[in-house]
């Protein structure tokens, strides 16, 4: 059998605050729980759900939760259910709501000397207690002329006077919380003494120079008084009027003229009526004085034919608001149609060539009229005049590609080399008309050049190829000076290109011919072996029929080779000694030695009291300190070749002697004593 | 020995009406679920509605707003009120409680 | 709603061979919540198994129920004669709106 270990109770609960209906049961088997409530199966919500077999309520709701809610457990097996005992919530709450006449049907019904019920609309449970105010005043119980029924939520005034007139609220109060009435309610109850508005003066926007009219009228029992004020109290009358307002005239119905107006008359006027009983009414009204600023100006527009696009006039600041209209060829644009003016926008719809032009916003109110011109462009598809031709540049001069187009507005041009877009920079350049100018023709800019020229409304290509006519060179120049080693095979290239292969040969310079041992083959000279006599002027020369001959001319010189005949070794000197590093070169022509030590090339007008580089090349560093350690490059080098060879130099602290070894005993180590 | 009687089959017009019955007897009706499945020929088993002790009730879509289940607790019978019947409603149908105890079944025909 | 599959459709056996009969279900069914059945031609169904491996009283012991999840078993160990039948397998959740499998028949080879 199912048995309930927990079952859920009747239980007081706030409205909008949490709770929970407990259940719990024992059964042989597994059984579903679920709820009910007022016998309907309970669905689970995000504010209502089962927690476990309980049922939570993130928030009780007075309506969705008013009932009697059951738990039963179910062994679907079998199909016997238990069902607990029923529970329901005595759920607190309060809720705000209006003060609403309850009496007389409505507020026209109202009169001096009659009953009034106003009733507050703040509901609750348990029952509240309500409490009236009276301009924020509270009303007690009791008090003259009014009752109070907190069962009937009602405020009787019996009889309502003018002295009841003023806002009523309630407020009210239980074990849940508070409310205040949501909308309150606006006794008037006229006294016939008291001064009553008939006409109240409106705000004015005048322009600079024109006349202004406040009216204003009062009715009372006797007739009430009637006064103008401006903003510093100054009293407006007919006999007595301030500095700044001499042309102001009251009239006998109250409204009140200012002629001429000028900025020191814009403020506030009021305008105050008095009854022989009652407060004094206060109405006030602005004098603004009309001003219109300036209007931004437009950038020019550039639409494309059978478009539809919008152009927005924004109205210069100013009082009143200035009105907005366009006009085009002087012409006011209608409120429909093609082209036509939608708010403050002008509208062209499947934009033509013929809408091309300038149209105008104009802008005005009371202060004047201000205008905007915005020039508008339909763009048309670029169309040839002339077309990039197929070239032949010439390489080493200027080269142009032509790419003449027409369109509006003035189409931009592109080229592209290769696919590849060209960016300006010193070797091409494109001109206005679109012109593509190559400064320095190379052979590498044979290839294929495309031109586009677009406007917004489209754009149209052409390509054609260039062909570069090469011009006869060296490729590359023969250095002009070079070595030949003595006694060692040679050879000194020499090749060039041209429009046709051209055909090359090695002279001498003085016309001699080559001797035999040196051979010309294909423009490369091969010295077999290098005597004393091959050095000399050797002339290289290029031919081809259309282009003629090039020359160049290569000074040879026959050198022996750099060999060192002393190099420098690995040398460890101590401290504070002389440091010697020997390095002898020989050569033809007789190389001459420079040092590098620790990076840096050692000048010898520069090198100090320490070191010395000598004749014979070798240097010496004296007082060595530790900061000389390093590695030191004897760099040999004549007109024909050079040649370098390096050592370390280390510097140590000198040694403190130990008893058993003898003075005579040598140093781990090379070591160079001085 | 727990029994389960069934009766009111028979044979109907689309959109008539039929009330099915079943008697339960051998333990404490008013304290179990109770609900009808029924079998069109040749198909599967299709739940129909199910009515709780306490009176709750539950319904497939197919059947809503045309079916009513209710129940007699002191004559121990369960009741299934079919109106508006369709030709797609003929099948044998069963009265059941818990998942061991099925009625002997009565047939339902639609038929014009 | 769950939907119950059960494969195959039809399965022919000889008695003394073991069945073994599939339910797959759409999403998740607590183990507790489902049951198998068997129907005879002109019969009510009859409880076999409920709470995926419990046999209901009177319910030989070559019969039993296994799996979890999405994936549930009814195998019959050693078939009799009398084992020939339509099988469907139901789930039975927190409402009381059952489902049903489609059936398995179980065929004499």
């Known amino acids: 059998a199912i048995v309930f270990i927990k079952q859920p109770s009747s239980q007081d609960a706030l409205q909008g605050r949490r709770a929970l209906l407990r259940c719990e049961v024992e059964a042989p088997g597994p059984v579903h729980v679920y709820w009910l409530l007022d016998g309907a199966p309970v669905q689970d919500t995000e504010r209502r759900f089962a927690q476990g077999s309980s049922l939570s309520f993130a928030a009780v709701d007075r309506l969705q939760d008013s009932g009697t809610f059951q738990c039963v457990a179910r062994d679907d097996v079998t199909g016997e259910e238990a069902r607990s005992a029923n529970a329901s919530f005595n759920i607190k709450w309060i809720e705000a709501g209006p003060v609403v006449l309850k009496h007389p049907a409505s507020e026209a019904e109202i009169q001096p000397q009659t009953q009034v019920t106003l009733r507050c609309h703040i509901d609750g449970h348990p029952r509240p207690t309500y409490q009236w105010f009276r301009d924020g005043t509270p009303l007690s119980d009791g008090q003259s002329n009014h009752t109070v029924s907190s069962k009937e939520r009602n405020l009787t005034l019996r009889p309502a006077g003018p002295e009841h007139s003023g806002l009523y609220s309630c407020c009210a109060h239980s074990a849940f919380g508070q409310a205040c009435s949501s909308q309150n309610f606006t006794l008037s109850i006229a006294d016939e003494s008291f001064a009553r508005v008939v006409l109240a003066p409106q705000d004015v926007v005048v322009a600079r120079y024109e006349e202004a009219m406040f009216h204003c009228q009062f009715s009372a029992q006797p007739p009430p008084s009637l006064q103008w004020l401006f903003e510093d109290e100054t009293p407006i009358t007919n006999r007595s009027r301030p500095p700044h307002l001499r042309r102001a005239t009251v009239f006998a119905n109250g409204s009140l003229l200012l002629t001429q107006v000028r900025p020191r008359n814009a403020g506030i006027y009021r305008c105050i009526g008095q009854g022989q009983r009652g407060p004094p009414i206060i109405l006030e009204a602005t004098l603004h004085l009309a001003e219109i600023e300036d209007m931004p100006l437009f950038e020019p527009r550039v639409f494309t034919a059978g478009s539809e696009e919008r152009v927005t006039c924004l109205p210069p600041k100013g009082l009143p608001e200035p009105s907005v209209w366009w006009e085009h060829a002087g012409v006011r644009l209608p409120t429909h149609g093609r082209v036509y003016q939608k708010g403050h926008e002008l509208v062209l719809a499947n934009i033509a060539e013929s809408d091309a032009g300038v149209y105008t916003c104009h802008a005005a109110n009371l202060a004047g009229q201000r205008r905007q011109d915005v020039n508008i462009t339909v763009a048309t598809v670029p169309s040839w005049l002339k077309k990039p031709q197929d070239s032949q540049l010439e390489e080493g001069k200027p080269g142009y590609l032509d790419c003449l187009t027409q369109a509006t507005p003035k189409p931009t041009v592109v080229w592209y080399r290769n696919q590849m877009l060209i960016s300006e920079d010193s070797r091409f350049e494109v001109f206005k008309n679109g012109t593509l100018r190559i400064n320095s023709v190379e052979v590498y800019d044979g290839t294929w050049y495309r031109c586009m020229s677009s406007t917004p409304a489209g754009s149209i290509e052409a390509q054609a190829r260039v062909q570069v006519l090469e011009k006869l060179k060296f490729t590359p120049p023969p250095q002009p000076q070079q070595c030949m080693e003595f006694d060692k095979e040679a050879t000194v290239p020499c090749s060039a290109t041209g429009r046709e292969k051209p055909t090359i040969k090695w002279e001498r310079a003085d016309g001699s011919s080559l001797p035999e041992w040196v051979t010309d083959n294909a423009g490369t000279l091969h010295f077999a072996r290098v005597t004393r006599d091959d050095a000399g002027n050797y002339t290289c020369i290029a031919s081809n029929g259309p282009q003629g001959q090039i020359r160049a001319h290569v000074q040879l010189t026959v050198a022996v080779f750099i060999t060192f005949k002393v190099e420098p070794e690995r040398t460890t000197v101590y401290q504070g000694h002389t440091a010697l590093l020997q390095c002898e070169a020989q050569g033809d022509p007789k190389p001459l030695i420079q040092w590098k030590g620790k990076d840096r090339i050692l000048d010898p007008t520069k090198l100090g009291p320490r070191m010395h580089i000598f004749q014979n090349g070798s240097l010496v560093i004296h007082d060595v300190a530790p900061e000389d350690s390093g590695r030191y490059t004897c760099i040999a080098g004549n007109s024909c070749n050079i040649k370098h060879t390096e050592a370390p130099l280390y510097v140590v602290d000198k040694p403190v002697p130990e008893e058993s070894e003898g003075p005579g005993s040598p140093p781990p180590y090379k070591m160079i004593q001085t | 020995e727990v029994q389960l009687v069934q009766s009111g089959g028979g044979l109907v017009h689309p959109g008539g009406s039929l009330r099915l019955s079943c008697a339960g007897s051998?333990?404490?009706?008013?304290?179990?679920?109770m609900y009808w499945v029924r079998q069109a020929p040749g198909k599967t088993l299709e739940w129909v509605s199910a009515i709780g002790s306490g009176g709750d009730t539950y319904y497939a879509d197919s059947v809503k707003g045309r079916f009513t289940i209710s129940r007699d607790n002191a004559k121990n019978s369960l009741y299934l009120q079919m109106n508006s019947l369709r030709a797609e409603d003929m099948a044998v149908y069963y009265c059941?409680?818990?998942?061991?105890?099925w009625g002997q079944g009565t047939l339902v025909t639609v038929s014009s | 709603e769950i939907v119950l599959t059960q494969s195959p459709g039809t399965l022919s056996l000889s008695p003394g061979e073991r069945a073994t009969l599939s339910c797959r279900a759409s999403?998740?069914?607590?183990?507790?919540?489902l049951a198998w059945y068997q129907q005879k031609p002109g019969q009510a169904p009859r409880l076999l198994i409920y709470g995926a491996s419990s046999r209901a009283t009177g319910i030989p012991d070559r019969f039993s129920g296994s799996g979890s999840g999405t994936d549930f078993t009814l195998t019959i160990s050693r078939l009799e004669p009398e084992d020939f039948a339509v099988y469907y397998c139901?789930?039975?959740?927190?409402?009381?709106?059952?489902?049903f499998g489609q059936g398995t028949k179980l065929e004499i080879k």
């Open positions: 999403q998740s069914v607590s183990s507790s919540y």
């Open positions: 139901q789930q039975y959740g927190s409402s009381p709106m059952y489902t």
């Open positions: 059941a409680r818990g998942l061991g105890y």
């Open positions: 051998g333990f404490t009706f008013s304290t179990y679920l």
